[in-house]
């Protein structure tokens, strides 16, 4: 399977909410022994590999934000902890999964990574990630609403193994 990032750049004004999205593509095994671990974290454009470093989002780690379920099942993060930090990650039946960040500030600007790990018989088998940038703007140059920029076709199917 692959992970697609429909948008490579989100530009938002302070105070706005944004939903960053990734999509699971390709054949997804729906066997009973297969589950998917999906999560989000901040990172940087490393010298070696983008998304190799896992940093917290608003002090919540990738473990705090993870979803763990079968192939194309729907799921949401544990509400209390994430919502106290203005965050919610979710996954639908169609392979889309997202993180919503509320009341953005300039400090939320940076590189965000989604990670999908396929787990068979309790062992990590295959992992892929997608990357996108969020820029939060202040002042007179800030847009009135979030503006999204589509990934190039090459970027949108980010298949780099982690």
């Amino acid at each position: 399977f692959k992970v697609a990032t429909p948008y490579s750049l989100y530009v938002c004004p302070e105070g706005q909410n944004v939903t960053l999205t990734c999509r699971l593509l390709g054949p997804v095994d729906k066997g009973h022994d297969v589950t998917f671990y999906k999560t989000w974290y901040r990172s940087s454009r490393g010298e070696v590999q983008t998304c190799s470093e896992r940093r917290p989002i608003r002090n919540l780690t990738f473990q705090d934000l993870h979803l763990h379920h079968g192939g194309h099942q729907a799921a949401n993060t544990s509400h209390d902890l994430a919502q106290r930090h203005g965050l919610e990650s979710a996954s639908d039946h169609h392979g889309n999964f997202s993180i919503t960040m509320r009341n953005l500030t300039l400090l939320d600007s940076g590189l965000y990574c989604c990670l999908v790990v396929e787990i068979r018989h309790h062992h990590s088998e295959h992992r892929v990630h997608g990357a996108m940038e969020l820029q939060v703007q202040t002042g007179k140059d800030a847009p009135s609403n979030c503006v999204v920029y589509p990934s190039s076709s090459q970027d949108s199917e980010n298949i780099t193994a982690a």
Partner: antibody, heavy 121, light 111 residues
Framework: QVQLQESGPGLVKPSETLSLTCAVS?????????WNWIRQPPGKGLEWIGY???????NYNPSLESRVTISVDTSKNQFSLKLSSVTAADTAVYYC??????????????WGQGTLVTVSS | DIVMTQTPLSLSVTPGQPASISCRAS??????????LQWYLQKPGQPPQLLIY???NVESGVPDRFSGSGSGTDFTLKISRVEAEDVGVYYC?????????FGQGTKLEIK
């Protein structure tokens, strides 16, 4: 080793435009950092002017915003400051500085040596 | 703008003795549990250099006699044993909201 080096005229006439460049070496400007200008009038404290990211997003101090333009040239690994309609109050040492935004702290971890710009006729 | 106020504005310390500088922000500089407060030292004729970031994290290469503490609006920089090379002006700086702002500076001299 990351180094920043400011360059530009040391003397600017009142009402003209101050132009400075900061050359970045030992590090790619196309990374998750904000590239800042900060100034310090003689014998006084530090004032943040503004920053630019490699992708061209800027943020300026509202007190100077109407006169400031910061630009980036990724091909030359450098960024620049233009401050228009200068007066004697703009006389200061001008520093460029790097600030990571891949975390939440946004600290200035690398500074240039600074260049003194005097506004005088 | 967030106004940063340092006290004292100057202090004279005997080598080997401790020193303490306070910084107060006009509003909280916390963001989801992180204190967005830095300390810098500007030695004579040099640019500022980072000492402490996020209130209490000592920058790599900075001697361990420097420490930072505090949260919300009140912060402190401590030097456990002042050395001659510590002279200069100390600045606090907030990165919670733009414009980024600095304290007015505290000048440290050796007795």
């Amino acid at each position: 080793q990351v180094q920043l080096q400011e360059s530009g005229p040391g003397l600017v006439k009142p009402s003209e435009t101050l132009s400075l460049t900061c050359a970045v070496s030992g590090f790619s400007i196309t990374s998750d950092f904000a590239w800042n200008w900060i100034r310090q009038p003689p014998g006084k404290g530090l004032e943040w002017i503004g920053y630019i990211t490699y992708s061209g997003f800027t943020n300026y101090n509202p007190s100077l915003e109407s006169r400031v333009t910061i630009s980036v040239d990724t091909s030359k690994n450098q960024f620049s400051l233009k401050l228009s309609s200068v007066t004697a109050a703009d006389t200061a040492v001008y520093y460029c500085a790097r600030q990571e935004y891949g975390n939440y702290v946004w600290y200035f971890d690398v500074w240039g040596q600074g260049t003194l710009v005097t506004v005088s006729s | 703008d967030i106004v940063m106020t340092q006290t004292p504005l100057s202090l004279s310390v005997t080598p080997g003795q401790p020193a303490s500088i306070s910084c107060r922000a006009s509003e909280s500089v916390e963001y989801y549990g992180t204190s967005l407060l830095q300390w810098y030292l500007q030695k004579p004729g040099q640019p500022p250099q980072l000492l402490i970031y996020a209130a209490s994290n000592v920058e790599s290469g900075v001697p361990d006699r420097f420490s930072g503490s505090g949260s919300g609006t009140d912060f402190t920089l401590k030097i456990s044993r002042v050395e001659a090379e510590d002279v200069g002006v100390y600045y606090c700086q907030q990165s919670r909201k733009v414009p980024w702002t600095f304290g007015q500076g505290t000048k440290l001299e050796i007795k």
